[in-house]
């Protein structure tokens, strides 16, 4: 009789352990679902806010035609400026035409006045050729005036209405550029 009772007790204990395991699994599953839900909601929120706020450029960016521009409020060296633009899903400004150059310099005059702003132009150390960040060459009218006698890497910047060159390790403001969102209307 005693043996029978102890067997039943062991079985009950085993059952309890299994139930505890099941409860633990369920709690874990519930927590995982809650996390998934949180990410899903965040995604929906992002998508909805993008849909509602269908402005072609983010806040504090300036639009001109198909481009959005961000004029920095901090100084950094050229390489860090590029990183800062990438964080925003953009690259340093690439000036394609005189019209774009005029828009940029006109906007800078209104915003800040005559400061130095890094753009996505750098001089290849071996060939001495100026290239934009994507590897393309600037049009002949958009080559920096030679001002830098630096032995270090040389990068391009905008000041007033000119393109100039300087040691990439000097600190300047910078301008980022990204494509404007196309309106779906």
């Amino acid at each position: 009789k005693l043996l029978q009772v102890s067997t039943i007790a062991m079985q009950q204990q085993e059952k309890l352990i299994q139930q505890e395991r099941a409860l633990l699994n369920f709690t874990e599953w519930k927590r995982s679902c809650a996390l998934q839900m949180k990410y899903c909601q965040a995604f929906m929120q992002n998508s909805l806010s993008s849909a509602h706020n269908s402005s072609p450029c983010p806040n504090n960016w300036i639009q001109n035609r198909e481009s959005c521009y961000y004029v920095s409020e901090i100084w950094s060296i050229w390489h860090t400026s590029q990183e800062n633009c990438l964080k925003e899903g953009s690259t340093l400004l690439q000036i394609e035409s005189k019209e774009e150059m005029d828009f940029i310099t006109g906007s800078l005059r209104k915003i800040k006045g005559s400061y130095d702003y890094w753009v996505g132009l750098s001089q290849d150390g071996h060939s001495g050729r100026w290239l934009w960040q994507d590897g393309s060459s600037p049009s002949p009218g958009l080559l920096p005036a030679e001002r830098s006698q630096s032995a270090n890497q040389v990068c391009g910047y905008v000041k007033s209405n000119s393109l100039l060159s300087s040691n990439c390790s000097t600190w300047k403001y910078f301008i980022c550029e990204k494509y404007a969102l196309r309106s779906s209307v």
Partner: nanobody, 116 residues
Framework: QVQLQESGGGLVQPGGSPRLSCAAS????????MGWYRQAPGKQRELVAA???????AYADSVKGRFTISRDSAKNTVYLQMNSLKSEDTAVYYC??????????WGKGTQVTVSS
């Protein structure tokens, strides 16, 4: 947590053309840009190439015209096609993701050794 898995590195002959891949997986996140960086022994880590979610590209001067970065947005994967490799391209190549929430994620790196 976000995982970045690089592949495609190894021993390559000078002039060779390997392609590196970096696949991002884990919790859902929006990507602002993805990039490849490299670090040669005794040198600082430097940006090699990057691509934004809009498709804009940026390259280091030393690789312009030889390397091409591309992406597959659907797979959250970025590729680096490396052509005309030189011994100075020997380094550990790291993948980096700039997420829209401001977070940045690094891969563990893949070794590329250019030697005959």
């Amino acid at each position: 947590q976000v995982q970045l898995q690089e592949s495609g590195g190894g021993l390559v002959q000078p002039g060779g053309s390997p392609r590196l891949s970096c696949a991002a997986s884990g919790r859902f996140f929006r990507v602002n840009a993805m990039g490849w960086y490299r670090q040669a022994p005794g040198k600082q880590r430097e940006l090699v190439a990057a691509i934004t979610n809009g498709g804009q590209t940026a390259y280091a001067d030393s690789v312009k015209g030889r390397f091409t970065i591309s992406r597959d947005s659907a797979k959250n994967t970025v590729y680096l096609q490396m052509n005309s490799l030189k011994s100075e391209d020997t380094a550990v190549y790291y993948c980096k993701v700039f997420a829209a929430d401001g977070m940045e994620y690094w891969g563990k790196g893949t070794q590329v050794t250019v030697s005959s």
